[in-house]
């Protein structure tokens, strides 16, 4: 039975040209995290494998930095980066937990962080 929950940074906004940290946290489970995938829609951004470490997809290697922790830092943001991002926690023996973050990249300097929320 899957007992864990994923807490994410929720709905966030950032300025064009700036950077943002995408962060998820898995709690309420003793399952072992074997890998975390970061995806944007169906596109793989990065993988953090428990044994092999971080792997950044070639199309994002110049704009994505691993961390902090199991999070991901997006740099040199453009308006095209607006959209949904998913952290996918692969765990043993529970299975897969998924968290969702919505990022809005703004032209102006009125970027502010949204509230945190939980996904079961």
């Amino acid at each position: 039975m899957m007992t864990g929950t994923i807490e994410t940074t929720g709905n966030i906004s950032a300025e064009k040209g700036g950077s943002i940290i995408l962060q998820c946290h898995l709690s309420s489970t003793t399952a072992q995290v074997t890998q975390v995938n970061w995806e944007q829609q169906d596109q793989l951004l990065a993988i953090c494998n428990a044994d092999l470490g971080w792997h950044i997809s070639p199309s994002f290697k110049d704009r994505v930095a691993p961390g902090p922790g199991l999070g991901l830092t997006l740099q040199s943001l453009t308006v095209n980066d607006t959209g949904e991002y998913f952290c996918i926690y692969h765990t043993y023996p529970d299975g897969t937990y998924t968290g969702r973050i919505f990022l809005e990249v703004l032209e102006s300097s009125v970027a502010e962080h949204g509230a945190r929320f939980q996904i079961p």
């Epitope: 074997t34 993988i47 494998n49 092999l52 470490g53 950044i56 070639p58 290697k61």
Partner: antibody, heavy 123, light 109 residues
Framework: QLQLQESGPGLVKPSETLSLTCTVS??????????WGWIRQPPGKGLEWIGS???????YYNPSLKSRVTISVDTSKNQFSLKLSSVTAADTAVYYC???????????????WGQGTMVTVSS | EIVLTQSPGTLSLSPGERATLSCRAS???????LAWYQQKPGQAPRLLIY???SRATGIPDRFSGSGSGTDFTLTISRLEPEDFAVYYC??????????FGGGTKVEIK
């Protein structure tokens, strides 16, 4: 579709370095989801994994061969290479390259293989 | 390392018969990391099963995999002439390193 092709000398002298290259066609070696691996098979025997590499150069090796193995990648040529130093007759084998799905988790396997190349170690 | 022991070493059967191949691990392996391959003489291995029970693309449904923990099985429900070959199991952990079983030869009786 994706194809892999091994190339290199079929005969290597004892104590020298075995060098092989795998050329990937029909797809990019710079795939975010896959490593690229080397496996060998001595005549009449089973399969032994040697090591694997990611497009960025990250590697993981079989500990029993690690001290003698170097695997490198050239994304501009869509190739990855194997070097095995200080070879002996025990290194005589068919050497295969294959796509390594270690990062795909529930699909972890070598799903696409080259046809293999025989390397004999002899003086 | 995790040692995979395959049995029997050789299986002598006739076309149309059922083949049951065993792969036993020296320590527990996640079923997600267990694969089966078929190899014919002079050819490269071909992936049959990944994740212990999922058929790879293009593999006929007469091939099925099962098992968990330390005991895994490959079953060929009705042997076709092209199924006579050597079969290998493989576990794909990183630490300890990935290993192959010694193989089971399925030969014509």
């Amino acid at each position: 579709q994706l194809q892999l092709q091994e190339s290199g000398p079929g005969l290597v002298k004892p104590s020298e370095t075995l060098s092989l290259t795998c050329t990937v066609s029909g797809g990019s070696i710079a795939s975010g989801s896959y490593y690229w691996g080397w496996i060998r098979q001595p005549p009449g025997k089973g399969l032994e994994w040697i090591g694997s590499i990611y497009y960025s150069g990250q590697t993981y090796y079989n500990p029993s061969l690690k001290s003698r193995v170097t695997i490198s990648v050239d994304t501009s040529k869509n190739q990855f290479s194997l070097k095995l130093s200080s070879v002996t007759a025990a290194d005589t084998a068919v050497y295969y390259c294959a796509r390594d799905g270690v990062l795909t988790l529930n699909k972890r396997s070598f799903d696409i293989w080259g046809q293999g190349t025989m390397v004999t170690v002899s003086s | 390392e995790i040692v995979l022991t395959q049995s029997p070493g050789t299986l002598s059967l006739s076309p149309g018969e059922r083949a049951t191949l065993s792969c036993r691990a020296s320590q527990s392996v996640s079923s997600s990391y267990l694969a089966w391959y078929q190899q014919k003489p002079g050819q490269a291995p071909r992936l049959l099963i990944y994740g212990a029970s999922s058929r790879a693309t293009g593999i006929p449904d007469r091939f099925s995999g099962s098992g968990s923990g330390t005991d895994f099985t490959l079953t060929i429900s009705r042997l076709e002439p092209e199924d006579f070959a050597v079969y290998y199991c493989q576990q794909h952990t990183v630490r300890p390193p990935l290993t192959f079983g010694g193989g089971t030869k399925v030969e014509i009786k």
